[in-house]
Interface confidence: medium
């Protein structure tokens, strides 16, 4: 079953290559287990950036080597992606799945365009 997901259109990563955005979903029921996946679309290719499953009211748990962290609040997830470079600029899509209890719902946002600008190297000082 389909579900509405919203996310901001544009986000600019900071000078340390970190970008944060919010993903909000309309929960048709009282989901207790939610899975959030961040997908990156660039040059018509879609790749999975990170994913986490969490119990409502608990922290999101990503894999240890994940570049993502996040927190949840109600029907909203605050996602942070770290270690971004200019080449990582692209459309980052939030996919939300209500895993439990049934019925299963899935929604995909329109995507957040994340712009990453590599910092200029500091000039050598004599």
């Amino acid at each position: 079953k389909a579900m509405h997901v919203a996310q901001p259109a544009v986000v600019l990563a900071n000078s340390r290559g970190t970008a944060s955005f919010v993903c909000e979903y309309a929960s048709p029921g009282k989901a207790t287990e939610v899975r959030v996946t961040v997908l990156r679309q660039a040059d018509s290719q879609v790749t999975e950036v990170c994913a986490a499953t969490y119990m409502m009211g608990n922290e999101l748990t990503f894999l240890d080597d994940s570049i993502c962290t996040g927190t949840s609040s109600g029907n909203q997830v605050n996602l942070t992606i770290q270690g971004l470079r200019a080449m990582d600029t692209g459309l980052y899509i939030c996919k939300v799945e209500l895993m439990y209890p049934p019925p299963y719902y899935m929604g995909i946002g329109n995507g957040t365009q994340i712009y990453v600008i590599d910092p200029e190297p500091c000039p050598d000082s004599d």
Epitope: V5, A6, Q7, P8, V22, A26, N75, Q76, N78
Partner: nanobody, 127 residues
Framework: EVQLVESGGGLVQPGGSLRLSCAAS????????MGWFRQAPGKEREFVAA????????YYADSVKGRFTISRDNAKNTLYLQMNSLRAEDTAVYYC????????????????????WGQGTLVTVSS
């Protein structure tokens, strides 16, 4: 500074319909939760309905559930309140309000969580 301007109020007979609009200036409209409140003559201002920043989740006072529908068009920076099956007790000045923090998940009906208010538009339900 964002400005909120309501319109669409007027005189309507019981059982009739009205659609209120709230036009917001500025480019940050889509980042904020929005709400409608109303104040009847001699009464305190009360919560009517609210909508989340992305337009995904909506919330209503029990007194208007099933009769009023809140919606938003982020491309047009406009908030709406469709009011059907109007009753005499819906007579009030209707205010739109902007949430206090971008991408908030407070989902509150408390007036204190809204940072900006319009001037209001009068809705009179009478035969």
């Amino acid at each position: 500074e964002v400005q909120l301007v309501e319109s669409g109020g007027g005189l309507v007979q019981p059982g009739g319909s009205l659609r209120l609009s709230c036009a917001a200036s500025g480019r940050t409209f889509s980042s904020y939760d929005m709400g409608w409140f109303r104040q009847a003559p001699g009464k305190e201002r009360e919560f009517v309905a609210a909508i989340s920043w992305g337009g995904v989740n909506t919330y209503y006072a029990d007194s208007v559930k099933g009769r009023f529908t809140i919606s938003r068009d982020n491309a047009k920076n406009t908030l709406y309140l469709q009011m059907n099956s109007l009753r005499a007790e819906d007579t009030a000045v209707y205010y739109c309000a902007r949430g206090s923090a971008p991408y908030s998940s407070s989902r509150s009906s408390a007036q204190e969580t809204y940072a900006q208010w319009g001037q209001g538009t009068l809705v009179t339900v009478s035969s």
